[in-house]
């Protein structure tokens, strides 16, 4: 049976709206929930596309609005259609289309031919896409001043660029409890908006924002050491696109150290954790004397998946330790703000030469030189750092 509705189903998840002049909005389309394809044609009263129009069309993959009266597509029009991959807006009345409209979409093709597009910086992104052959862009006409049938590139004098963003930071070292003033300087044409992204800072400082384009200020009040390795980001947008810059505020604090008991892995490991900013220098003592590192006994840092913390974890790695390595291990950590030490006793092997009154007295033996700290370990797999 032929469909007499404004919009008729096509297959299990398509909708076709072609009865001339019957739509002025896409809001409230019936059965829109599972829609993957929407085809709209000959709708001269359909002039605007706002984000509310496509709400509830989360599965939409293909949208065609052609030979209609579309003059404006909101920058956030496709906020609720993240799966959209085919967009055809040809033969409408569009003079421009913001880069924000398609941001976040994985478009495979975009067709804008037959629109009176006006060449301006606001369409610079589109020209770039077309030049770079991205996602099958079809525009055919870009008008500089009046109607014309060829692609008219922006004049060489026209300087279209995203904003330039710079963050000014304190030169002096920052300590726990300080207030830190950051300033974000934005330069560029047709600046629209700018702000800070401070999601990583929760609990690390109290934040006060002030100022507006082109200069935004930020005060981090009563900073803690948790602020280290956390990104403070300033972003800005204009017609051409978005730029952002991130910095990290380094908050100095004294060295601290923690040692664990020796554990046997492929080799022996005395685990440690050290913290401090700047990163502390480390030194090991064995029974009170400086321990000289060798390929048999050395410091090995563990690769951390967490890049947002100052604490470093590692091992004093001992290959093949014997009784001469039994004793007291001390790790000293120091930075300009303080020093710390931690000690642990380790016993790797009984001394075969220790005298026990119950044992028969041996006729002769050669005691091992007890001063050596380089005698040592166990084994290690080829890609377990390290030997």
């Amino acid at each position: 049976a032929s469909c007499r509705e404004v919009c008729c189903p096509v297959g299990p998840s398509g909708l076709r709206c072609t009865r001339a002049g019957s739509l002025d909005t896409l809001r409230g389309l019936r059965g829109a929930g599972n829609l993957t394809e929407l085809y709209v044609e000959n709708q001269q009263h359909l002039q605007r596309l706002e984000f509310e129009d496509l709400q509830g069309l989360g599965e939409l993959r293909s949208l065609t609005i052609v030979k209609s009266g579309l003059r404006f597509v909101a920058p956030d029009a496709f906020r609720f259609t993240p799966r959209l991959s085919h967009l055809n807006l040809s033969s409408n009345a569009l003079e421009s289309l913001s880069w924000k409209t398609v941001q976040g979409l994985s478009l495979q093709d975009l067709t804008l031919s037959g629109n009176p597009l006006h060449c301006s910086c606001a369409l610079f992104w589109l020209q770039r896409w077309e030049q770079e052959g991205l996602c099958g862009v079809h525009t055919q006409t870009l008008h500089d001043s009046g109607p014309g049938d060829q692609f008219l590139p922006l004049g060489h004098n026209t300087s279209c660029g995203v904003p330039t963003v710079k963050i000014q930071m304190p030169n002096d070292s920052v300590e726990v409890g300080d207030d830190v003033f950051l300033q974000c300087q934005v330069e560029g044409l047709a600046l629209q908006q700018a702000d800070w992204i401070l999601t990583e800072l929760e609990g690390a400082a109290t934040v006060k924002k002030f100022g507006d384009l082109p200069s935004l200020g930020l005060i981090l009040v009563n900073v803690t050491s948790d602020l280290n390795k956390k990104n403070v980001t300033c972003w800005a947008e204009n017609d051409v696109g978005r730029a952002e810059v991130s910095v990290q505020v380094s908050v100095s604090f004294p060295a601290s150290v923690h040692l664990g008991l020796a554990v046997e892995q492929h080799h022996w490991c005395i685990p440690f954790s050290v913290d401090g900013q700047p990163a502390p220098s480390l030194r090991w003592l064995f029974n009170g004397s400086v321990l000289n590192e060798t390929s048999f006994i050395f410091t090995q840092f563990l690769e951390s998946a967490l890049t947002n913390e100052t604490m470093r974890h590692g091992c004093l790695r001992l290959n093949q330790p014997t009784h001469v390595n039994n004793g007291n291990y001390t790790l000293l950590a120091a930075n300009p703000y303080g020093q710390a030490a931690a000690s642990v006793m380790a016993a790797f092997m009984d001394n075969p030469f220790e005298f026990n009154p119950e044992d028969p007295i041996p006729v002769s033996f050669s005691p091992v030189d007890g001063n050596s700290t380089s005698r040592d370990p166990v084994e290690k797999k080829d890609e377990t750092p390290f030997g």
Epitope: Q320, T322, S374, R375, E379, D382, P385
Partner: antibody, heavy 118, light 107 residues
């Protein structure tokens, strides 16, 4: 697979210095100490010293402390040995070597033959 | 430093024969000894580590034994490719030292 690449030969004059290279591939370079071993023609093997590629820390046999200097270039994954004030006694093959799964030299370079001659 | 005294300095044998090379350490080094084979003009190759563990790919006719100060490398039934020089080495701290070597020649 693990490879340690060394140039084949160097001819140097007495009193001069020479810098030999050992380019590592096939493993995490900073995770294993690099060792250097000397072998004079028809003679045995002598351990010269070792270097930690992670931090440049070095240890030498007493005999080679004034003769050899070990260095590292992390970016090119290359270890170097510089031999100074060369005499005929320094004419030898110089090997770089690294431990394998255990603390023994499972991997060796091909060796560089240094000839000290006027 | 730990001295490694290797004997004999040279050895003549025929294909199929069994030979033993010994190494004595100047102090107790537990089982921290490695053995290497070296052919003329080539780099040494690891045969045995930790006194008796065969390195990867080493034929089972090679075997190592010993602990403390006395160690030996035995080749059961010599193959033509086994002729060359053999070195022991302690891996019990630095400085690492090698034995003077044993030259195994075809009789």
């Amino acid at each position: 697979q693990v490879q340690l690449q060394q140039p084949g030969a160097e001819l140097v004059k007495p009193g001069a210095s020479v810098k030999l290279s050992c380019k590592a591939s096939g493993y995490t370079f900073t995770s294993y100490w690099m060792h250097w071993v000397k072998q004079r023609p028809g003679q045995g093997l002598e351990w010269i010293g070792e270097i930690n590629p992670n931090n440049g820390l070095t240890n030498y046999d007493e005999k080679f402390k004034t003769k050899a200097t070990l260095t590292i270039d992390k970016s090119s994954r290359t270890a170097y040995i510089q031999l100074s004030s060369l005499t005929s006694e320094d004419s030898a093959v110089y090997y770089c070597a690294k431990y394998g799964n255990y603390v023994a030299f499972a991997f060796w370079g091909q060796g560089t033959l240094v000839t000290v001659s006027a | 430093d730990i001295q490694m005294t290797q004997s004999p300095a040279s050895l003549s044998a025929t294909v199929g024969e069994t030979v033993t090379i010994t190494c004595r350490a100047s102090e107790n080094i537990y089982s921290y000894v490695a053995w290497y084979q070296q052919k003329q003009g080539k780099s040494p190759q690891l045969l045995v580590h930790n006194a008796k563990t065969l390195a990867e790919g080493v034929p089972s006719r090679f075997s190592g034994s010993g602990s403390g100060t006395q160690f030996s490398l035995k080749i059961n039934g010599l193959h033509p490719e086994d002729f060359g020089s053999y070195y022991c080495q302690h891996h019990y701290g630095i400085p690492l030292t090698f034995g003077a070597g044993t030259k195994l020649e075809l009789k």
